[in-house]
């Protein structure tokens, strides 16, 4: 025999207390699939959370974060404070990146500058708290006969003329 509850569409629940009729989900609750025996309580976007999408009888509310915060976790389960670029969030609040590290976003941690010499390259633009270093061509790339890459004038090394 077919379960009578399977006929209950999204937005309703199979009410066992009332001969398994399909009762509409009460306000502030929803069922996103058919055949459900209860409706789920709608998520409330309160405090630092704000409503991105309202709840309906067939779908849960979706939250994001108020300005100055950003989402973390599946479905924006948490809101974390933004910091400025060049900072990272610590237990004591936003702190500037230490020398040799940078953060170009309002979230996340400070990461070490790229070590250009590991790739045999030179530093083209120095790093800052907000930006990574820019690695230039390797010294070999700048020798006569190499492919015609024209490095910016300020980065020219002594004794090398533009190709």
């Amino acid at each position: 025999l077919q379960d009578p509850c399977s006929n209950c569409p999204a937005g309703t629940f199979c009410d066992n207390n009332r001969n398994q009729i399909c009762s509409p989900c009460p306000p502030n609750s929803f069922s996103s699939a058919g055949g459900q025996r209860t409706c789920d309580i709608c998520r409330q976007c309160k405090g630092v959370f704000r409503t991105r999408k309202e709840c309906s009888s067939t779908s849960n509310a979706e939250c994001d974060c108020t300005p100055g915060f950003h989402c973390l976790g599946a479905g924006c389960s948490m809101c974390e404070q933004d910091c400025k670029q060049g900072q990272e969030l610590t237990k004591k609040g936003c702190k500037d990146c230490c020398f040799g590290t940078f953060n170009d976003q309002k979230r996340g941690i400070c990461r070490p500058w790229t070590n250009c010499s590991l790739d045999g390259k030179s530093v083209l633009v120095n790093g800052t708290k907000e930006r990574d270093v820019v690695c230039g061509p390797s010294p070999a790339d700048l020798s006569p006969g190499a492919s015609s890459v024209t490095p910016p004038a300020p980065a020219r090394e002594p004794g090398h003329s533009p190709q």
Epitope: N7, A10, G11, T12, D15, P24, P26, P27, S57, T58
Partner: antibody
């Protein structure tokens, strides 16, 4: 403009049939909005007839007294709901209202049509 | 579900506090709506979920109650409030959405 407009009322003889229509504009019936029918005999109380699920399922909720005589149906492509009334009696004479029962308003009737008068008389 | 409203009519003056009661034949939790109807017009939703004011309804209207006993209160009656008031169960199901038979509020004197 968000509105409900009923049509199809008029004079009908006892034992006859009538089909009322309720056209929705400015919104669509859905799982959040159920179309319902309510009637009011002259000088009498409001009387609930029934509602139909607003989405694609044909689940209806009806007052027991309507069984076998009144049927609610819906055409989603036309965003219209119907009330088929058979074996009409003098006591069915009333203004028939179409109403929107909304999840957002605790399933209260937050939007009503202007009503259409049905007179059952020989 | 049967809904019993009382009184069936009452007379009051502008500024009066008016209370109308509605009783359900079985528990309907907070699933109750109140409507106002004026002659020749369709009903207008005032309150839903027992005590939530519908959009655009003045704050002098309030609703309370849960289970089987509910109350509509008009804190200070205004000239435009003379009308008939209905309660309705919104506890969906067959026969679940019955109306009370109304309370007519008329001018005293």
């Amino acid at each position: 403009e968000v509105q409900l407009v009923e049509s199809g009322g008029g004079l009908v003889q006892p034992g006859g049939s009538l089909r009322l229509s309720c056209a929705a504009s400015g919104f669509s019936f859905s799982a959040n909005y159920y179309p319902c029918w309510v009637r009011q005999a002259p000088g009498k109380c409001l009387e609930w007839i029934g509602c139909i699920y607003g989405g694609s399922s044909d689940i209806t909720y009806d007052a027991q007294w309507t069984k076998g005589r009144f049927t609610i149906s819906r055409d989603n492509s036309k965003n219209t709901v119907y009330l088929q009334m058979n074996s009409l009696r003098a006591e069915d004479t009333a203004v028939y209202y179409c109403a929107r029962s909304a999840w957002y308003s605790g399933w209260g009737g937050d939007l009503w049509g202007q009503g259409t008068l049905v007179t059952v008389s020989s | 579900i049967q809904m019993t409203q009382s009184p069936s009519s009452l007379s009051a003056s502008v500024g009066d506090r008016v209370t109308i009661t509605c009783q359900a034949s079985q528990s309907i939790s907070n699933r109750l709506a109140w409507y106002q109807q004026k002659p020749g017009k369709a009903p207008k939703l005032l309150i839903y979920s027992g005590g939530t004011l519908a959009s655009g309804v003045p704050s002098r209207f309030s609703g309370s109650g849960s289970g089987t006993d509910f109350t509509l209160t008009i804190s200070s009656l205004q000239p435009e409030d003379f009308a008939t008031y209905y309660c309705q169960s919104t506890y969906y199901g067959n026969d679940g959405n019955a109306f009370g038979c109304g309370t007519k509020v008329t001018v005293l004197g």
